[in-house]
């Protein structure tokens, strides 16, 4: 899915209002310095691509994030504010339902959610080049969405 045409500000508002709190709840008892953030993203569409991947794609050692509250709210926000997103996810959702296991919070999942927090942080606070520039400094996002 191409996230270029999403309403980034609405997704950001959804994140700050609810999703972030669910991520904090999931990470409760874990020090913010415990995991080193290694996953990065260059612009807002890229950040959403990475967020979707980490949230919904099962990985080795962490297969259960899609059932978490933050994941369900993320899915809802993307469905509402990204045109055509929900249609692209129907097949993926069916496959996920079949593959689902019971919720288990592993250290690998905690590390993955820590990476997610970093991606969301980046999504919320992209730095812009000086006013008048038409794109970001280090990527090829030509849409120049405003700072906040």
């Amino acid at each position: 899915y191409d996230f270029t045409n999403c309403d980034f500000e609405k997704i950001k508002a959804a994140y700050l209002s609810t999703i972030s709190k669910d991520l904090i709840t999931y990470m409760s008892g874990t020090k913010s310095t415990e995991f080193n953030n290694t996953v990065s993203c260059s612009n807002r569409p890229h950040c959403l691509t990475e967020i979707q991947s980490l949230t919904f794609n099962p990985t080795a050692g962490c297969a259960s994030l899609a059932k978490e509250m933050f994941a369900m709210k993320t899915k809802a926000a993307l469905a509402i504010w990204c045109p055509g997103y929900s249609e692209t996810q129907i097949n993926a959702t069916q496959a996920m339902k079949k593959a689902r296991k019971s919720k288990v919070t592993t250290n690998k999942c905690l590390e993955q959610v820590s990476q997610l927090q970093g991606l969301w942080r980046r999504f919320n606070r992209p730095l812009l080049k000086q006013q008048g520039s038409s794109d970001y400094k280090d990527d090829d996002d030509k849409h120049h969405h405003h700072h906040h």
């Epitope: 730095l127 970001y136 280090d138």
Partner: antibody
């Protein structure tokens, strides 16, 4: 706990440049926006610019854009602010500050400040 | 640039009394229903410390005598019962639009 430690006080001549460093410890460096804010004696706070160390992307206050350069070294978790063509009005305390964990955009960790005095 | 104007410039309040500081932005700092306005406290010789984020949310470890309100262009920081340790300069900051801008500061003293 995350800490930001800045380089020591500087005394500079008008027309010269100054480079202030800000070393982060106790947490991830590359995925947080790092900002520079200055405060002239008895004055308020003035935002100069910021950097995302993950890819070196920067944003500058237009007021300083021709004179300020913000860089970061991920290997040492250090951010730098260089200000050129110094004038007496640049005499100030320069702070580095890190944004919060959650993307709210507030500055939750600050360096102790570096005093830069510009005098002939 | 968004200009942040605080009032008053200085304020003297008796211990235990309410202190109110206002901040007006030259244009709205709201976006998608959220207000991107923060408040900081700065004591002499120290860096600023966050008090309130996004207009009304209390920062970590900040006493609940501090509160914030407002939206759009008009915001208020309130200290419900002034304590001696609250003597400081208070700044509002908008982060909705680059460049990020601060108010000129309000100096709070004890009467």
């Amino acid at each position: 706990e995350v800490q930001l430690v800045q380089s020591g006080a500087e005394v500079k001549k008008p027309g010269s440049s100054v480079k202030v460093s800000c070393k982060a410890s106790g947490g991830t460096f590359s995925t947080y926006n790092m900002h520079w804010v200055r405060q002239a004696p008895g004055q308020g706070l003035e935002w100069m610019g910021a950097i995302y160390p993950g890819n070196g992307e920067t944003s500058y206050n237009q007021k300083f854009k021709d004179r300020v350069t913000i860089t970061a070294d991920k290997s040492t978790s250090t951010a730098y602010m260089e200000l050129s063509s110094l004038r007496s009005e640049d005499t100030a305390v320069y702070y580095c500050a890190r944004e919060d964990d959650y993307g709210e955009g507030y500055f939750d960790v600050w360096g102790q400040g570096t005093t830069v005095t510009v005098s002939s | 640039d968004i200009v942040m104007t605080q009032s008053p410039d200085s304020l003297a309040v008796s211990l235990g009394e309410r202190a109110t500081i206002n901040c007006r932005a030259s244009e709205s700092v709201d976006n998608s229903g959220l207000s991107f306005m923060h408040w900081y406290q700065q004591k002499p010789g120290q860096p600023p410390k966050l008090l309130i984020y996004r207009a009304s949310n209390l920062g970590s470890g900040v006493p609940d005598r501090f509160s914030g309100s407002g939206s759009g262009t008009d915001f208020t920081l309130t200290i419900s019962s002034l304590q001696a340790e609250d003597v400081a300069v208070y700044y509002c900051q908008q982060i909705n639009t680059d460049p990020l801008t601060f108010g000129q500061g309000t100096k709070l003293e004890i009467k």
